[in-house]
Interface confidence: medium
């Protein structure tokens, strides 16, 4: 299977842009755009804190924790109105991700 330049193999993802804003103390805001070429019924998402192709039904229902977006050992919770999710580390530190 030969791919054109810039074309992704099915089932694969790449990070297109990654911007970091560390202007606020003790808080880093990262904005990431991911491009994926997914199998049928899948869509770009996040699994185990990495870009991945996920079940499209998860995106439709906004049940973000169903992507398993957090690292092993963390806990996942939906944000209010399903705008994203939080990953809580064993030490209590919380990483919040919003979807746009």
């Amino acid at each position: 299977q030969f791919l054109k330049e810039g074309q992704l193999a099915a089932g694969t993802c790449e990070i297109v842009t990654l911007d970091r804003d560390s202007s606020q103390p003790r808080r880093t805001i990262a904005r990431q755009t991911v491009k994926c070429s997914c199998f049928p019924g899948q869509i770009a998402g996040t699994t185990r804190a990495r870009p991945a192709c996920v079940d499209a039904r998860i995106i439709k229902t906004k049940q973000w924790c169903d992507m398993l977006p957090c690292l092993e050992g963390e806990g996942c919770d939906l944000l209010i109105n399903r705008s994203g999710w939080t990953c809580t580390q064993p030490g209590g530190r919380i990483k919040t991700t919003t979807v746009s």
Epitope: G11, C13, G41, A52, V54
Partner: antibody
Framework: QSLEESGGRLVTPGTPLTLTCTAS????????MGWVRQAPGEGLEWIGI?????STYYASWAKGRFTISKTSTTVDLKMTSLTTEDTATYFC???????????????????WGQGTLVTVSS | ELDMTQTPPSLSASVGETVRIRCLAS??????ISWYQQKPGKPPTLLIY???NLESGVPPRFSGSGSGTDYTLTIGGVQAEDAATYYC??????????FGAGTNVEIK
């Protein structure tokens, strides 16, 4: 990290039964969980899965008769209209997603309980 | 309904031989296959996931290959402790996921 099934026993046909899988050492909010059964001397048979959110999917033969639900630390398998064909060891398994280098995502049943025996006999 | 045809049902091998177990899916499962080893009276343990990824802690003599509908588990240089039943689990979506019937491996 461990899983332990309980609730298996001898029941008569038609009796409902609920099996419980208790998870220790990890958060159920960050994994899928599945149930698998194995009749004596036979192979493994997939029953169904529960997502982190509580969404469920079942094997076609299990729909309607088997129900999977969960709390923060346990996963239940509720079985109704049991027949002698349902005699088996029932396993719960943790289902993680392994992500490859480029975003390939695959499920891994990476942690299993020891199983609980359900015997259906008149 | 997905069907996973696993062959052979049983085999006998001598220590050091290479053993191959095949699973054929009734439809393309996009490498959505994992392989498990089960010993009598014990739960299964994961060997390979995503067709070819070796689970951590599993000896490198175990390997997986294949794509589309055709997948193989290979044990290169089989050892006495590899005597067990091996199962493939295939499926592309959770509403259609199935175990193969199993292969019983006996070591002579």
């Amino acid at each position: 990290q461990s899983l332990e099934e309980s609730g298996g026993r001898l029941v008569t046909p038609g009796t409902p039964l609920t099996l419980t899988c208790t998870a220790s050492g990890f958060s159920l909010s960050n994994y899928y969980m599945g149930w698998v059964r194995q009749a004596p001397g036979e192979g493994l048979e997939w029953i169904g899965i529960i997502y982190a959110s509580g969404s469920t999917y079942y094997a076609s033969w299990a729909k309607g008769r088997f129900t999977i639900s969960k709390t923060s630390t346990t996963v239940d398998l509720k079985m109704t209209s049991l027949t002698t064909e349902d005699t088996a060891t029932y396993f719960c398994a943790r289902i993680d997603i392994g992500v490859g280098d480029y975003g390939w995502a695959y499920d891994r049943l990476d942690l299993w309980g020891q199983g609980t025996l359900v015997t259906v006999s008149s | 309904e997905l069907d996973m045809t696993q062959t052979p049902p049983s085999l006998s091998a001598s220590v050091g031989e290479t053993v191959r177990i095949r699973c054929l899916a009734s439809e393309d499962i996009y490498s959505g296959i994992s392989w498990y080893q089960q010993k009598p009276g014990k739960p299964p343990t994961l060997l390979i996931y995503g067709a070819s990824n070796l689970e951590s802690g599993v000896p490198p003599r175990f390997s997986g290959s294949g794509s589309g509908t055709d997948y193989t588990l290979t044990i290169g240089g089989v050892q006495a402790e590899d005597a067990a039943t091996y199962y493939c689990l295939g499926g592309y979506s959770y509403s259609s996921i199935t175990f193969g019937a199993g292969t019983n491996v006996e070591i002579k």
